[in-house]
């Protein structure tokens, strides 16, 4: 039994880091493998992660972490019974994938303005809470070409756009994702999308 693709890990910079790897053949990850991880820290203790299958030869492990700070460094040991298959390390702050924003809501009752709001996925005491920026994706269900991205570079989790920038009388969907420049993170997954019917009063034409 050998590791074909070494574990790569990403952290949500809160409580979970996810490691994925591939074996050289079909493997029952949960019965055959264990991933041990330990904070490089005086008097810390090793923890065991039981991996799940992720495709035939792929494995994934969700490492539970009691908070994360920038100095954290973990040792990782992948075991098959008594055999050490791979040894490595992982610094969560260098491999951050933020959590996806939630509770995306479209408020359509604000005088021809669409107000989109969502929730910051981090609690106020987490470092990323004040460092997230967002991308909002809006698209038409009827017209695949009607697809736009709005970059929200301020901290407030909201976006205002004029309803008239979208077509009237048709349905739209929106979703939002986050990233943090301070840790050069990857983008989060997209939030679940939300749907609304866009309608607004056309201004009277004056002759």
């Amino acid at each position: 039994m050998k590791v074909l693709q070494e574990p790569t890990c990403v952290s949500d910079y809160m409580s979970i880091s996810t490691c994925e790897w591939k074996m050289n053949g079909p493997t029952n990850c949960s019965t055959e493998l264990r991933l041990l991880y330990q904070l490089v820290f005086l008097l810390s203790e090793a923890h065991t992660c039981i991996p799940e299958n992720n495709g035939g030869a792929g494995c994934v492990c969700h490492l539970l972490m009691d908070d994360v700070v920038s100095a954290d460094n973990y040792t990782l040991d992948l075991w098959a019974g008594q055999q050490l298959l791979w040894k490595g390390s992982f610094k969560p702050s260098e491999h951050v994938k933020p959590r996806a924003p939630g509770n995306l809501t479209v408020h359509t009752n604000v005088s021809d303005t669409l107000l989109l709001t969502w929730s910051n996925p981090y609690p106020p005491d987490n470092y990323l809470y004040n460092h997230l920026t967002y991308a909002v994706n809006i698209w038409s269900e009827n017209d695949p070409a009607d697809f736009r991205i709005y970059n929200v570079t301020y901290l407030e989790p909201s976006l205002r756009i004029a309803a008239s920038t979208l077509k009237s009388g048709i349905s739209y969907r929106a979703r939002v994702r986050a990233w943090a420049q301070c840790y050069n993170t990857t983008w989060s997954e997209w939030s679940p999308s939300t749907k609304w019917h866009n309608s607004y009063r056309e201004p009277f034409e004056q002759h």
Partner: antibody, heavy 120, light 108 residues
Framework: EVQLLESGGGLVQPGGSLRLSCAAS????????MHWVRQAPGKGLEYVSG????????YYANSVKGRFTISRDNPKNTLFLQMSSLRAEDTAVYYC?????????????WGQGTTVTVSS | EIVLTQSPGTLSLSPGERATLSCRAS???????LAWYQQKPGQAPRLLIY???RRATGIPDRFSGSGSGTDFTLTISRLEPEDFAVYYC?????????FGQGTKLEIK
């Protein structure tokens, strides 16, 4: 209420031994690394020794290595420090302290301390 | 072994002023953690800051920590009468634990 209560301090002659105890209440001892920190009269804080939550690993400052032994009894919620070959420079208030990995070594609960005096 | 040096040894300020306490490590500490404690006469120390910049439970937001590498700072934005005490920095790393010698913050 979360509390640490040290006992076992006293006056001892140079070369003698003492066993300090620390009774924990209001929390589960086995979830925390535990430590002893001392403070000589009018001086600053000095780290003495620590033990991991399960007791599987220990650490000693160079000044006490080979003379002091830290141990714990998690079911009884008690921490110990066995001190032998005591010297005058071991005279201090000894604090029992807890730390959780979440606090990255920050010691969030301290006992009120027990005084050890080494003198002839 | 890393040595922590705190400065100044004594800081004399008045209530309402801003206090800046320094803690310098003898070598860079990328994978270690810095904490700050407050100790009043006859009392055990109290944890203020852990992980360089995170406030411990119940600590007022006038206390803040910052720094990296070898230089770390505890800032008290607006001194209250109860803040006058001795402050210690502490380094907790992969192989050792060390305290600074302390800074006494006294009323001017």
């Amino acid at each position: 209420e979360v509390q640490l209560l040290e006992s076992g301090g006293g006056l001892v002659q140079p070369g003698g031994s003492l066993r300090l105890s620390c009774a924990a209440s209001g929390f589960t001892l086995s979830s925390y690394a535990m430590h002893w920190v001392r403070q000589a009269p009018g001086k600053g804080l000095e780290y003495v020794s620590g033990i991991s939550p399960s007791g599987s690993s220990t650490y000693y400052a160079n000044s006490v290595k080979g003379r002091f032994t830290i141990s714990r009894d998690n079911p009884k919620n008690t921490l110990f420090l066995q001190m032998s070959s005591l010297r005058a420079e071991d005279t201090a208030v000894y604090y029992c302290v807890r730390s959780k990995v979440r606090y990255r070594g920050g010691m969030d609960v301290w006992g009120q301390g027990t005084t050890v005096t080494v003198s002839s | 072994e890393i040595v922590l040096t705190q400065s100044p040894g004594t800081l004399s300020l008045s209530p309402g002023e801003r206090a800046t306490l320094s803690c310098r490590a003898s070598q860079g500490i990328s994978s270690a953690y810095l904490a700050w404690y407050q100790q009043k006469p006859g009392q055990a120390p109290r944890l203020l800051i852990y992980g360089t910049s995170r406030r411990a439970t119940g600590i007022p937001d006038r206390f803040s920590g910052s720094g990296s590498g070898t230089d770390f700072t505890l800032t008290i934005s607006r001194l209250e009468p109860e803040d006058f005490a001795v402050y210690y920095c502490q380094l907790y790393g992969a192989t050792s634990v060390t305290f600074g010698q302390g800074t006494k913050l006294e009323i001017k």
